[in-house]
């Protein structure tokens, strides 16, 4: 049984059952407007890809990584440091499957900080590990300017002022 700050997820022989009832197929709204259906079965199959990773009690495992969903709110930089202090980093989203997993485990529909900000040095959106965002996968709604940081809401990525206070997600 995997316990997150959001919902309980359980993989049983390739199918997920969870405390909060979702339909078997979730709609993923990709930011360019296209849609892709991702089943709970897909989520469980990909999550079981690396069973060797074991997360700490308050962290949720998915695809060989561990995720922690905050309950409080901080600015982007304070959220960034909070994750660092726990030898983790703000969420880096690699693909739509991961986005779907994150969305299913978010309790509320408000903005949540992720590890993406606009760096004036590179003049581009950059993940906290230094890699650029893949514009073919993700589209960021809002201005690309200094002091812009990214937050997710309902599977979309938004540009927000970094000093705004939102919940956040750590990952390792």
């Amino acid at each position: 049984l995997l316990v997150s700050q959001g919902v309980l997820l359980k993989c049983q022989k390739g199918s997920c059952s969870n405390a909060t009832q979702y339909e078997d197929t979730g709609d993923l709204k990709v930011n360019n407007g296209t849609r892709r259906n991702i089943s709970n079965k897909d989520l469980c199959a990909s999550r079981s890809a690396d069973q060797t990773v074991l997360c700490q009690s308050e962290w949720l495992k998915y695809q060989g990584k561990c995720y922690w969903f905050s309950n409080e709110m901080k600015s982007w930089s304070d959220s960034y440091v909070y994750c660092l202090e726990r030898k983790s980093h703000l969420l880096i989203i690699h693909d739509q499957l991961e986005m779907a997993f994150i969305q299913k485990n978010l309790r509320q529909l408000n903005y949540v900080w992720i590890g993406l900000n606009f760096t004036s040095l590179k003049m581009t959106w950059t993940w906290v590990d230094g890699s650029p965002i893949d514009s073919k996968i993700f589209f960021i709604k809002g201005p690309a300017k200094e002091n812009s940081c990214a937050a997710i809401k309902e599977s979309k990525i938004f540009s927000e002022t970094c000093s705004s206070v939102f919940k956040w997600i750590c990952q390792y």
Partner: antibody
Framework: QVQLVESGGGVVQPGGSLRLSCAAS?????????ICWVRQAPGKGLEWIGC?????????CYATWAKGRFTISKDLSKNTVYLQMNSLRAEDTAVYYC?????????????WGRGTLVTVSS | DIQMTQSPSSVSASVGDRVTITCQAS??????LAWYQQKPGKAPKLLIY???ILESGVPSRFSGSGSGTDFTLTISSLQPEDFATYYC????????????FGQGTKVEIK
Amino acid sequence: QVQLVESGGGVVQPGGSLRLSCAASGFSFSGNYWICWVRQAPGKGLEWIGCIYAGSSGSTCYATWAKGRFTISKDLSKNTVYLQMNSLRAEDTAVYYCARDTGSGYWKYNIWGRGTLVTVSS
Amino acid sequence: DIQMTQSPSSVSASVGDRVTITCQASQSIGRDLAWYQQKPGKAPKLLIYGASILESGVPSRFSGSGSGTDFTLTISSLQPEDFATYYCQGADRSSTPSWPFGQGTKVEIK
């Protein structure tokens, strides 16, 4: 050479206070790692006291038993971390070590000081 | 706070023996566990971190295993310099981090 040196230990009366220092050389107290205090009573095991984050936040965390009586702080200009101990008791008699957590993704205290002895006695 | 429970508290062994020390966390700590060796009058020395990763310079006769709540330190063939006290240390990544030690295991000469 990267090292930590503790100082400030000595004999103190029950109910008294003491401030221990942990000075760094070979690196600076600013980075993505924790500086921690650990103690060891005579003939006993290691006991974690608490830590301070070397980064800008300066976050601190303490063992439940240490909260309230023990305070960890840092002075970046002196490259030193402090352990303020109040309301000392006989059972606080121990060698006090400071240790540095690595800046990597793993939890490990890879740098230790030699320790300073605190004796609480009347 | 998490609690670390180490066993046995002491073990008598001879040179060449295989020695196993266990450590149990009160809740899952993933693989966030380190092992230290301490000799009288000295500061602890890091042996293993990440539950199974050998610190640089540590002999390969030392090995660590486990994840979640149960961990093991093994010395495959005890050497004279290995007689010491061994401690496990867990790391808690929660909102209130903590780094508790186990009670220690003294490895003595039989």
